[in-house]
């Protein structure tokens, strides 16, 4: 028999040599040895040269061997998990070339001070990094820019002082993040880009809260669905968010998110963040934009956060309490008046491919009684949007275009916001904010606002189309009027030609966000419902055969906001992808919004 | 077409030993992992051992220490020493080859009935 | 060990009618590293040896009619006969290829009504 025990799992043949009081490595390995449990002997020094011939080896572990070095002269090509943890090594040599399919790197309750800035070089598989239970004083720039498909980074329990600002820069599947128990005084400005984190630990370090943490402390509001409190033994999935875990040293341990910052510089360099403190408790609107595709999957999210001038900003962050578990895989941009220039990002595969459409708009009005009317109201100043809504299915074959147009206005002075799904006008002063289907972009300041264009070029045997509605609106004070041009090629053969409308109005001084609304759709259904205490809601379900095209990214002054949080769970585009073999059009995303 | 052929079975008494033999033709014996499973009279299947292809032996508790299987591949042959038997270890003993390096059993013996009795 | 828990015991069947055998594990079979469940059944005829039918849950042997099928995930599996015929009579085992010791169900015994 075997001085270690052998059994199989998952085709793997797992070998059990721990606490064997082993020096060396037994000469009785099995040559297709999958997993290989080393753990809790005395080994000393460890080299991979040594595991060579071990073709099949899947799986490492080497904790607890009272390991003071580690040589890696020998390519280990199968190998995607090391658990090197609970030993005294002080360094790591680098890594890549040896365990060039390694997934997961466990280095955790080790000795480790610093580490060189290419040890984790060649690792482009890592998806889970523990260096938690060291002593790191600080990182190198660009640790982490080999191990873009990293989900899980844990750098809890070091004497980490500082942060490097890009960090986190690439690391678009990051989705636990556990920076417990360091000496960090602050967050630098920018570092979490607009990843969107589902599992973040930040307690129990020195938060200095002076004006240089507010980019964290708004990070914080705006994720406080996602910050955790880490407690040994527990499953995070089975804990709640508690993002008052993360407190100002220097104030009381009060809770950094709440830090006032009074006296505070409020221009958007100084937190990385639009200005958000002369934004008043009003209602918000928000429109996402989920993709995915039959291919890699990919998400990309727009948010809208739009609202008159008034006070603070402070007040409707903590007003907007978060309750439901983070999802995984979503970035958010939130963009207020403030300049800033964001457009999709340029991560999605084009492929052809079947979408289903589906737009839900979802506007808190203020604390007023909607009723839907079909009737038209005298514009006088009343607090009771008057809503049109209509209903439009194309039968299977029909070969006549139906055209629709949903009008929805709203009288003078009116503070309830109004959802739409085709034409939006806004007479007189007025706060509501509308969503799009189209790309977002927001201009730096300028007094020339920036044309807009739809284009849909649709498929060549087509028999039913509906008509294609942009709307845009523009306040008075524009010094330039925004051309606003709609246009839709068919190519030939199309039995139907397909209507198209634009909009232009330009209404009195407004600090309405106003935004192209663009729909696609042989089949098209919008319903208005204003259920009692309950948000007006409006639907939009599209079914097309679509290539995406996407503007490169700019750079941007976004930010992240927790896709759970319930109060600006508002307007949602989900484009759902299942296989065709369906004739594709092209739709060019090249739709731009001006932002007043 | 595979084949696995069974043989060594008999009446033995318990304590004693007994080695079953599985010739197998018909594939690349070598290539293959392969398997004892045993059935008791009006009872169900339960795994006995395995080798792999490359010679490594791994065994459920219950007959650790005490069966040994191994290989042959110059006779395409897999062996099943059992030593130490049991009354328990009554059954038909069944040859079967594993698909690559999964743990299903694609094709079987046979089979050949042991009976440890006094 | 993983445990097998089959039902029902036996299965009276109508021939040309479907058939449902449920197989329960004690502890999960998929391997999240390539989302495979490792789940096989086997059918074994009377006086015959074992057959095997399906491997990974749903995947079917070759030669084995299409009328068998295979589902489930984790922990709860199913094995699906559409139409009985008569010469699907026999015992029919589960038999988790997750991890060793491989371990089966206690069996299914089918049998025409």
């Known amino acids: 028999q075997h001085t270690c025990s052998i059994s199989k799992v998952t085709s793997l043949l797992e070998v059990n040599c721990e606490n064997k009081k082993l020096t060396a490595l037994p000469a009785d390995l099995p040559a297709d040895t999958g997993i290989l449990h080393l753990g809790e002997n005395q080994l000393g020094t460890f080299s991979t040269a040594s595991l060579v011939h071990f073709t099949h080896l899947t799986y490492l572990y080497l904790d607890r061997c009272e390991l003071t070095s580690l040589q890696t002269n020998g390519k280990l090509i199968k190998l995607e998990n090391l658990d090197l943890s609970h030993n005294n090594l002080k360094s790591l040599p680098s890594l890549g070339w040896a365990l060039p399919a390694l997934t997961t790197l466990d280095v955790s309750f080790n000795k480790l001070g610093s580490l060189s800035p290419g040890v984790l070089d060649g690792l482009s598989q890592l998806q889970e990094l523990y260096l938690q239970n060291n002593d790191l004083k600080s990182l190198p720039p660009g640790l982490l820019l080999p191990t873009t498909k990293l989900k899980k980074l844990n750098l809890a329990n070091n004497k980490l002082r500082e942060l490097p600002s890009g960090l986190l820069d690439g690391l678009e599947d990051l989705d636990t993040l556990y920076l417990q128990r360091n000496w960090l005084r602050t967050i630098p400005k920018g570092f979490f880009g607009t990843l969107l984190l589902p599992f973040v630990f930040l307690h129990a370090n020195s938060w200095y809260c002076d004006c240089e943490i507010l980019y964290f402390r708004h990070w914080l509001q705006e994720n406080a669905n996602n910050v955790y409190l880490w407690k040994q033994g527990v499953d995070v999935k089975d804990t709640t968010p508690n993002v008052a875990s993360v407190r100002c040293a220097n104030l009381d341990n009060a809770p950094v998110y709440s830090y006032p910052g009074k006296g505070c510089p409020t221009s958007s360099g100084d937190t990385d963040y639009d200005d958000y403190d002369d934004i008043p408790d009003v209602p918000a609107t928000r429109t996402e934009v989920k993709f995915s595709t039959n291919t890699k999957v990919h998400t990309t999210h727009w948010s809208l956060l739009a609202a008159a001038p008034s006070t603070s900003q402070d007040s409707q962050m903590i007003s907007l309490p978060p309750t439901h578990k983070p999802t995984k895989k979503q970035s958010t941009f939130i963009h207020t008046q403030s300049p800033g220039f964001t457009t999709l990002p340029e991560t999605m595969e084009s492929n052809p491919t079947f979408y289903s459409l589906k737009l839900n708009t979802v506007l808190i009005p203020s604390p007023t009684t909607l009723e839907p009317t079909s009737t038209q109201a005298t514009p006088e100043p009343n607090i009771q949007p008057m809503l049109t809504t209509s209903t439009l299915t194309t039968p299977e074959h029909s070969t006549t275009p139906v055209p629709t147009t949903t009008i929805l206005t709203t009288p003078e002075h009116s503070t309830i916001p109004v959802p739409t799904t085709a034409i939006l006008t806004t007479p007189k002063p007025s706060t509501i904010p509308v969503p799009t289907t189209a790309t977002l972009t927001t201009l730096e300041p300028s007094t020339t606002p920036v044309p807009t264009t739809a284009t849909l070029t649709t498929p060549e045997p087509s028999t039913t189309l509906v008509p294609t509605t942009a709307t845009l609106t523009t306040p008075e004070h524009s010094t330039t009027p925004v051309p606003t041009t709609a246009t839709l090629t068919t190519p030939e053969h199309s039995t139907t030609p397909v209507p198209t409308t634009a909009t232009l109005t330009t209404p009195e001084p407004s600090t309405t966000l106003t935004n192209l609304v663009s729909t696609i759709s042989p089949v098209l259904t919008t319903t208005l419902t204003t259920p009692e205490s309950t948000p007006i809601e409006t639907i939009l379900e599209q079914f097309f055969t679509t290539e995406l095209t996407l503007l490169p990214t700019l750079e941007s002054t976004t930010t992240i906001i927790p896709e759970q949080n319930s109060f600006l769970n508002l307007p949602e585009v989900a484009l759902v992808s299942s296989d065709t073999s369906e004739s594709s059009p092209f739709l060019n995303s090249d739709f731009c919004c001006f932002l007043p | 077409q595979v084949q696995l052929v069974e043989s060594g079975g008999g009446v033995v008494q318990p304590g004693r030993s007994l080695r079953l033999s599985c010739a197998a033709s018909?594939?690349?014996?070598?290539?293959?992992?392969m398997s004892w499973v045993r059935q008791a009279p009006g009872k169900g299947l339960e795994w006995v051992a395995s080798?792999?292809?490359?010679?490594?032996?791994y065994y459920p508790d219950s007959v650790l220490g005490r069966f040994t299987i191994s290989r042959d591949n110059s006779k395409n042959t897999l062996y099943l020493q059992m030593n130490s038997l049991r009354a328990e270890d009554t059954a038909v003993y069944y040859c079967a080859r594993s698909r690559g390096y999964e743990d299903y059993f694609d094709y079987w013996g046979q089979g050949t009935l042991v009976t440890v009795s006094s | 060990d993983i445990v097998m828990t089959q039902s029902p015991l036996s299965l009276p069947v109508t021939p040309g009618e479907p058939a449902s055998i449920s197989c329960k594990s004690s502890q999960s079979l998929l391997n999240s590293r390539n989302q495979k469940n490792y789940l096989a059944w086997y059918l074994q005829k009377p006086g015959q040896s074992p057959q095997l039918l399906i491997y990974?849950?749903?995947t079917r042997e070759s030669g084995v009619p299409d009328r068998f099928s295979g589902s489930g995930s984790g922990t709860d599996f199913t094995l699906k006969i559409s139409r009985v015929e008569a010469e699907d009579v026999g015992v029919y085992y589960c038999q988790q290829h997750y991890s060793s010791p491989w371990t089966f169900g206690q069996g299914t015994k089918v049998e025409i009504k």
């Open positions: 080798i792999t292809s490359a010679g490594t032996p």
């Open positions: 990974f849950t749903s």
């Open positions: 018909g594939f690349t014996f070598s290539s293959f992992a």
